[in-house]
Interface confidence: medium
């Protein structure tokens, strides 16, 4: 009967660096002739082991082939590399000149298991902005067998890739994978991560992960606001420029005065928000006594090499108020003056005329009357310092408010003159902590005759610190 060559395993998987055995048995030692092992078939097949001749350092017999009647021609390959992958054939030859092949085993395919490299996630070269779609690519290489799973996640949510390819498509010793996913950025993504997860038989259900921090790929531009704070003293106006919720930190802030650079800020102490973005506040003290004309202050913010964001704020000079008046400020986020300035001035003039007419009318009534009467009027002070100003404009107010400075010393106040019984006395109560409604437009007439005094004991207590302006009007 014809000799039969048996290779029991159709395939075997072995880890790179490990050893494997390729089994081969024959049913007869006849006809006389050697057994050889080859990888591959045809002309290009490679001799792996020949028991009688040649030097094969990593291959050796499993059993003792020198023993009589040995029919086991299994071989052991040590320190397997991915290049050892392929189909191995145990082939029986008949001795001759040359030897002739008479029978071959069915072949055993050797799969060399190789771990994938840690996945590398790459993103766009330039930072994207919220609502922009950006692509991320994940690459891993050097794995075998070809079967592999790749998943994308953003903050725990699985994402669907645009495409995933494993190359080469044919048989190879090892393979590479590349996958692309599209992510829509949002302003809350500074702390977000995009994760590429690779699972392979060699990893024991412990996937490899590649991580891209979106903080490296996102730009959140700041919102810039200029506001005016309450004056700390007579001749100072505090301007604040606030850049909010920006990322990355790279920020330059410049104050300009009528278009000329006044101060350059390189922010150091940024405050960090929980979403990973930053805030920065720059204070600018304006010396009001130095300006008689209107001044446009500009806060110019350059973020992450992007075009500058500018916010203007107009401060009206002395020419717009009484001799003792403090400066007025107007937010102006355009290059031109805010129309509110003109509307405000018009309203102020109109009210001034009305007040003058009212004053004249009162004087006429007083002249007619034989006996005086007392009436009381209250004017609300909106901000902190009642001493210095009667009205501070909120930068968000739409209406223009013109005001005069009471400029009263804080020291010892003169004792109030006792009003005569027939005098007409009016009280202007200036209460701290109360903010006027934006629609209240106040214009004050000349207060030559105003005397400021501590409030006399009142029938009911005042809700906050109050000062009274007592206006004495003599009856003619």
């Amino acid at each position: 009967t014809e000799v039969k060559v048996t290779q029991p395993e159709k395939s075997v998987s072995v880890a790179a660096g490990d050893s494997t055995i390729l089994n081969c048995t024959v049913t007869s030692l006849l006809p006389v002739g050697p057994i050889r092992w080859y990888r591959g078939v045809g002309q290009s097949r490679l001799l792996i082991y020949n028991q009688k001749e040649g030097h094969f350092p990593r291959v050796r017999n499993v059993s003792d082939t020198t023993k009589r009647n040995n029919m086991d021609f299994s071989i052991r390959i040590s320190n397997v590399t991915p290049e050892d992958a392929g189909t191995y054939y145990c082939v029986k030859f008949q001795k001759g000149s040359p030897d002739t092949e008479i029978q071959s085993g069915g072949g055993t395919e050797v799969y060399v298991l190789a771990k994938p490299s840690p996945p590398e996630v790459s993103g766009p070269a330039d930072r994207g902005i919220p609502d922009q779609k950006v692509n991320f690519t994940c690459k891993s290489h050097g794995f075998s067998p070809r079967n592999i799973t790749l998943k994308w996640f953003k903050d725990g949510q699985e994402l669907h890739p645009l495409e995933t390819t494993v190359n080469p498509s044919g048989k190879n010793v090892s393979y590479n994978i590349s996958s692309t996913v599209r992510v829509v950025l949002n302003s809350m993504d500074v702390n977000s991560k995009v994760i590429c997860e690779v699972a392979h038989i060699t990893l024991d259900r412990s996937p490899l992960r590649g991580i891209a921090n979106l903080s490296n790929f996102i730009r959140v531009s700041p919102t810039v606001k200029v506001t005016q704070q309450s004056p700390t003293s007579m001749n100072q106006v505090n301007l604040t420029c606030r850049a909010e919720r920006f990322y990355p930190e790279d920020l330059q802030l410049i104050w300009l005065e009528n278009g000329n650079v006044s101060r350059n800020d390189t922010p150091k102490n940024l405050t960090k928000n929980t979403d990973g973005t930053y805030n920065y506040t720059s204070l600018f003290l304006v010396n009001s006594s130095a300006h008689r004309e209107d001044v446009v202050f500009t806060c110019q913010v350059k973020h992450d090499q992007q075009p500058a964001i500018t916010r203007n704020h107009t401060v009206l000079g002395f020419a717009h108020s009484s001799d003792q008046g403090s400066m007025q400020t107007f937010p102006d986020n355009n290059a031109t003056h805010n129309w509110n300035v003109f509307i405000g001035v018009g309203v102020a003039c109109a009210l001034l005329v009305v007040l003058l007419m009212a004053a004249l009318y009162l004087l006429r009534i007083k002249q007619k009357k034989a006996k005086g009467s007392t009436s009381s009027t209250r004017l609300h002070e909106p901000e902190k310092n009642a001493r210095e100003i009667t009205q501070i404009q909120d930068t968000n107010d739409i209406n223009d408010i013109t005001y005069a400075d009471l400029n009263l010393p804080k020291e010892k106040k003169p004792a109030p003159r006792a009003p005569e019984p027939n005098n007409h006395t009016e009280y202007a109560s200036i209460e701290t902590g109360k903010v006027p409604r934006p629609e209240d437009t106040l214009t004050y007439a000349d207060l030559d005759m105003v005397h400021l005094s501590r409030a006399q004991p009142a029938p009911k207590p005042e809700p906050s610190f109050s000062e009274y302006a007592s206006v004495q009007v003599q009856r003619k």
Epitope: A15, R76, S78, D204
Partner: antibody, heavy 120, light 107 residues
Framework: EVQLVESGGGVVQPGRSLRLSCAAS????????MIWVRQAPGKGLEWVAS????????YYADSVKGRFTISRDNSKNTLYLQMNSLRAEDTAVYYC?????????????WGQGTMVTVSS | DTQLTQSPSSLSASVGQRVTITCGAS??????MHWYQQKPGKQPKLLIY???NLEAGVPSRFSGSGSGTDFTLTISSLQPEDFATYYC?????????FGQGTKLEIK
């Protein structure tokens, strides 16, 4: 003659640790993958962990992952199983076995086993 | 994970009888199915590897067949020393699962 001898078993309280050893002889230890299999009293066989000859490929059963660690010292021809955070359900006879060359081959030689009892 | 189900769970047979034990896999394990014999108080012993290959030193009355998801261990003529518990095991991919075992008893 191929021999595998396990040691290190005993009675231990839940939450405690134990380290099992398996001394190999009669074959080239560094050529073979090794495994641990356990058998709870009156129950079937359960594969616990395996390690390739070069220690580059290690696998665990879900039931022990994160608690047990398989390792080997080829210079000492010894296989180890470090068992931490032991539970009552880990009570079993633990066998070490040799895996014939290659991932897909069977476990051709087994040790006699060592008993681990987890009890308070 | 690949689940292996052996049937029957237990079996009573007489010496000289032909016995067949089957093992079903929840998914294909190709030909990477092995059979072990275990006697009480002893370690398991390899009988058949890669579905149909007889391990060295194992009597020829033991044979195995099958591929994919269905496998069979056959003992052509039961001998007194064959009464034991038999397990199938797959090594296609980790975790390397075992069947629940088939206990073969003397009738």
């Amino acid at each position: 003659e191929v021999q595998l001898v396990e040691s290190g078993g005993g009675v231990v309280q839940p939450g405690r640790s134990l380290r099992l050893s398996c001394a190999a002889s009669g074959f080239t230890f560094s050529d073979y993958g090794m495994i641990w299999v356990r058998q709870a009293p009156g129950k079937g066989l359960e594969w616990v962990a395996s390690i390739s000859s070069s220690s580059s490929y290690i696998y665990y059963a879900d039931s022990v992952k994160g608690r047990f660690t398989i390792s080997r010292d080829n210079s000492k021809n010894t296989l180890y199983l470090q068992m931490n955070s032991l539970r009552a359900e880990d009570t079993a006879v633990y066998y070490c076995a040799r895996r014939y060359y290659g991932f897909n081959y069977p476990f051709d030689y087994w040790g006699q086993g060592t008993m681990v009892t987890v009890s308070s | 994970d690949t689940q292996l189900t052996q049937s029957p769970s237990s079996l009573s047979a007489s010496v000289g009888q032909r016995v067949t034990i089957t093992c079903g896999a929840s998914k294909s394990v190709r030909t990477y199915m092995h059979w072990y014999q275990q006697k009480p108080g002893k370690q398991p012993k390899l009988l058949i590897y890669s579905a149909s290959n007889l391990e060295a030193g194992v009597p020829s009355r033991f044979s195995g067949s099958g591929s994919g998801t269905d496998f069979t261990l056959t003992i052509s003529s039961l001998q007194p020393e064959d009464f034991a518990t038999y397990y199938c095991q797959q090594s296609n991919e980790p975790p390397y699962t075992f069947g629940q075992g088939t206990k073969l008893e003397i009738k």
